[in-house]
């Protein structure tokens, strides 16, 4: 039998590769089985999560699974970082492992790195 | 329940190129990583990399990188791994392992792929 | 890269008994997620390897609860309470805490 706590599955160690100013969705997946909990998003500050109050957010459901997605619109060069999404259950917080935001700035990059450069080589993305 | 078959038996010559396939179902493919781990003949185990199929970013050990290249297929739900410049040593059962929504645990594995280098 | 060392490379045992398998990593497996990534896999002649142990200690469903696992930072014991004959086969522990995630070299277990 299925557990009923609720799960956030976002992937440990998780890294995206994104331009600055293109539009993206960090997704956080949500396992749960009756109630829907209220899940927030936090960017990381050192080993403070700082709560993002004020930017886009929605709901997107599938069979098993669903999904509190965080909106870029557009993505900005200072969204580089961690995020983090977490949910209140039954008086439990229950947090997420952090995802990473790689965000190139296309104004600053002569040339666009590939996916590969940009997951093993962070650096180019500060050139 | 979750299942990875692998594709078939390779015999390859000396700086030919492999490509192995890793179909998998019973999960949502995209909500997990897809790991490339190998093993010599009668020797131990070695983690290549994996990669996270939702979006294509990969991780290798550095002793592979540039050799090797992971690719995935949310259509088809199938990883792949090719393994270029082959050498003898790269002779070895290769395994594809999936884990539980990305934990990074190596929970599940395909039954294998032999890759036998020869001239 | 982390090293992953295992002792002892092989060890005997007569049916019933105990067995011990150490492994020890060359920096501590506790992540910034306070969980430490150490896994031990099974691997029985002409099989794929299967996991045992995750998180140190916590028992694969399946797995007989005769097999145990122990540890923290750069220390880690799998124990066998009483060793069957279906136990053959060559164990290895894995760190997947730091990249490259790295195995230890494995140990044979053979019946006596």
């Known amino acids: 039998k299925e557990s009923c706590d609720v799960q956030l599955y976002i992937k440990r160690q998780s890294e995206h590769s994104i331009l600055a100013g293109d539009p993206f969705e960090l997704e956080c997946p949500v396992k749960y089985c009756a109630n829907r909990p209220h899940v927030t998003w936090c960017k990381l500050n050192g080993t403070t999560c700082v709560k993002l109050e004020d930017r886009q957010t929605s709901w997107k459901e599938e069979k098993n699974i669903s999904f509190f997605i965080l909106h870029f619109e557009p993505v900005l060069p200072n969204d580089n970082g961690s995020y983090r999404c977490s949910a209140n259950f039954q008086s439990n917080l229950i947090e997420s492992h952090s995802t990473t935001l790689y965000v190139t700035d296309v104004k600053s990059a002569s040339e666009r790195p590939s996916k590969d450069e940009m997951a093993s080589r962070p650096w180019l993305l500060y050139r | 329940q979750v299942q990875l078959v692998q594709s078939g038996a390779e015999v390859k010559k000396p700086g030919a190129s492999v490509k192995l396939s890793c179909k998998a179902s019973?999960?949502?493919?995209?909500?997990?990583?897809a790991h490339w781990v190998r093993q010599a003949p009668g020797q131990g185990l070695e983690w290549i990399g994996r990669?996270?199929?939702?979006?294509?970013?990969?991780k290798y050990d550095p002793k592979f990188q540039g050799r090797a290249t992971m690719t995935a297929d949310t259509a088809s739900n199938t990883a792949y791994l090719e393994l270029s410049s082959l050498r003898s040593e790269d002779t070895a059962v290769y395994y594809c392992?999936?884990?539980?929504?990305?934990?990074?645990?190596?929970?599940?594995w395909g039954q294998g792929t032999l890759v036998t280098v020869s001239s | 890269d982390i090293v992953m060392t295992q002792t002892p490379l092989s060890l005997s045992v007569t049916p019933g008994q105990p067995a011990s398998i150490s492994c020890k990593s060359s920096?501590?497996?506790?992540?910034?997620?306070?969980?430490?990534?150490l896994n031990w896999f099974q691997q029985r002649p002409g099989q794929s390897p299967r996991r045992l142990i995750y998180?140190?200690?916590k028992l694969d469903s399946g797995v007989p609860d005769r097999f145990s696992g122990s540890g923290s930072g750069t220390d880690f014991t799998l124990k066998i309470s009483r060793v069957e004959a279906e136990d053959v086969g060559v164990y290895y522990c894995?760190?997947?805490?730091?990249?490259?995630?790295?195995f230890g070299q494995g140990t044979k277990l053979e019946i006596k």
């Open positions: 019973g999960y949502n493919f995209k909500h997990t990583y």
């Open positions: 920096q501590s497996l506790l992540d910034s997620d306070g969980k430490t990534y």
């Open positions: 894995w760190q997947g805490t730091y990249f490259p995630y790295t």
């Open positions: 998180l140190v200690s």
């Open positions: 392992v999936a884990d539980h929504y990305g934990s990074s645990l190596l929970d599940y």
């Open positions: 990669i996270d199929p939702a979006n294509g970013n990969t």
